[in-house]
């Protein structure tokens, strides 16, 4: 899975007037990393993990870059004609990736009111747009604006591609992000469901990377998908992830059930606690 840096910029307009604030979120390897708030842009590391990557007082550069990007996007929104009354948003998502073979990918995507209308491969400079007429009208409008100064655009987009990769490499050099593996903490809990049944929930937290297998087994055999309920794998704010799986079982049959976890080549089995309030915590 490649290392990635993802910028998500959003600007708003009200009744055709572009608002002064903007919001920028940066994700590093899929994790919330930096946030640039609406009114005063101050890059805020998302948790200790991000601070460790950035180091002390190195956010000035990020703040400057994100503020500049926000201004650019506000200007782009101002050039979108035929804006209807009310609130509208323009969103730019920029992603660059470094793959294991050191190859790179960079792309840029524009969304108006949450709908994708224009994408660009920042390496090949190739533009793509959806088929709908509304999206194509918006796309032509924005593309023309961005191409008004061809020289500026050329250097601008080359810089976007190069800068994104440069920043990503700089963050990776911190060593904090590099192909680390953090094993999950697994908790199994039980709660009363209907009469004669209990719900057993298996939670895995604090793991990295995000790929994980978590499932309930009966006598060592995985339960069918339709008898299990899974939570999404979500960032927990500490540079790691969390998820859960639950199922309903007959009271008295607890000993037949285990939660099976597999992560980064390691696995573990976790029984259902016998007491009602017991929580089993274990690392592999």
């Amino acid at each position: 899975e490649p290392h990635s840096l993802r910028y998500n910029l959003t600007v708003l307009s009200w009744d055709g007037s572009v608002q002064s604030g903007f919001l920028t979120e940066v994700h590093l390897d899929g994790q919330p990393f930096l946030r640039c708030d609406r009114q005063k842009c101050r890059a805020k590391p998302q948790g200790q993990w991000a601070e460790d990557v950035l180091g002390n007082k190195t956010w000035d550069r990020e703040t400057r870059d994100l503020t500049g990007n926000g201004k650019d996007l506000r200007m782009t929104l101002a050039h979108i004609k035929d804006q209807k009354e009310g609130l509208h948003s323009l969103q730019e998502i920029r992603v660059c990736e470094i793959h294991e073979d050191n190859s790179t990918r960079s792309s840029q995507h524009f969304y108006y009111d949450g709908e994708l209308f224009l994408s660009q491969n920042l390496e090949t400079k190739e533009w793509t747009m959806p088929q709908s007429s509304r999206a194509q009208t918006l796309a032509m409008n924005v593309r023309n604006f961005l191409k008004e100064d061809a020289m500026k655009t050329k250097t601008h987009y080359h810089a976007m591609h190069a800068d994104c990769l440069q920043e990503l490499r700089r963050y990776l050099k911190s060593g904090v992000v590099l192909r680390r593996t953090v094993p999950p903490m697994v908790n199994v809990t039980r709660s009363e469901a209907s009469e004669g049944n209990i719900t057993v929930t298996c939670r895995a937290s604090g793991f990295y990377p995000w790929n994980i297998t978590l499932s309930w087994r009966q006598d060592g055999v995985s339960l069918s998908h339709d008898t299990q309920q899974w939570g999404d794998v979500l960032p927990d704010g500490n540079g790691t992830y969390q998820t859960w799986v639950a199922t309903r079982i007959c009271q008295g049959e607890e000993q037949r059930f285990t939660c099976y976890m597999e992560h980064s080549g390691n696995h573990s089995t976790h029984p259902v606690p016998s007491g009602k309030v017991l929580v089993l915590q274990s690392h592999w």
Partner: antibody
Framework: EIQLVQSGAEVKKPGSSVKVSCKPS????????IYWVRQAPGQGLEWIGY????????IYNQQFKDRATLTVDKSTSTAYMELSSLRSEDTAVYYC???????????WGQGTLVTVSS | EIVLTQSPATLSLSPGERATLSCSAS???????LHWYQQKPGQSPRLLIY???NLASGVPARFSGSGSGTDYTLTISSLEPEDFAVYYC?????????FGQGTKVEIK
């Protein structure tokens, strides 16, 4: 390739004990349960019990609870089934098997013939 | 315990014929917990069909399974010479895990 290799045939006296070993390979030993099943000559299959090698949990068929002992040695990735107080009707082929993703017995050992005779 | 009764005990058929094997449970079981195994003389059993109707890896498409509740069926659409063997159904829904007594499919 997943394989379960069992120990060789045994001839035992009534009242004695037998210990059959099962060494799986081709997968992580502690990731799947090991089941034990026996088959008397010309008869059907009878489940003895299973062990979860990771946590050491054992579930027995009540019929064998007093005489069968299931163990694992994680250091050698080997499972064992010991049957005590042998009698002639325990003469059978004893199989170990691995629990699968979707069924109880997805891979089987080659079987160990235990003959109980005076 | 759930008792599985297989019928017939022996099925005498010729290659190319269709074989229908039945497995009846003494109480209802979920289709997720009914499996079929094939055993040839001197060999270990082999998983054939899991969860009522799913073919195990490497099992030819002429084998199929169906059923629900207490009645389950294994069908071999056209018997090949290598299909003559003993077939067992097995339930994993409740303890103890149990097998049927087997159906022997022999060459007529």
């Amino acid at each position: 390739e997943i394989q379960l290799v069992q120990s060789g045939a045994e001839v035992k006296k009534p009242g004695s004990s037998v210990k059959v070993s099962c060494k799986p390979s081709g997968y992580a030993f502690t990731s799947n349960n090991i089941y034990w099943v026996r088959q008397a000559p010309g008869q059907g299959l009878e489940w003895i019990g299973y062990i979860d090698p990771y946590i050491g949990r054992i579930i027995y068929n009540q019929q064998f609870k007093d005489r069968a002992t299931l163990t694992v040695d994680k250091s050698t990735s080997t499972a064992y089934m010991e049957l005590s107080s042998l009698r002639s009707e325990d003469t059978a082929v004893y199989y170990c098997s691995r629990s699968g993703e979707r069924s109880n017995f997805d891979y089987w050992g080659q079987g160990t013939l235990v003959t109980v005779s005076s | 315990e759930i008792v599985l009764t297989q019928s017939p005990a022996t099925l005498s058929l010729s290659p190319g014929e269709r074989a229908t094997l039945s497995c009846s449970a003494s109480s209802s079981i979920s289709s997720n917990y009914l499996h079929w195994y094939q055993q040839k003389p001197g060999q270990s059993p082999r998983l054939l069909i899991y969860r009522t109707s799913n073919l195990a890896s490497g099992v030819p498409a002429r084998f199929s399974g169906s059923g629900s509740g207490t009645d389950y069926t294994l069908t071999i659409s056209s018997l090949e010479p290598e299909d003559f063997a003993v077939y067992y159904c097995q339930q994993g829904g409740s303890l103890p895990l149990t097998f049927g007594q087997g159906t022997k499919v022999e060459i007529k």
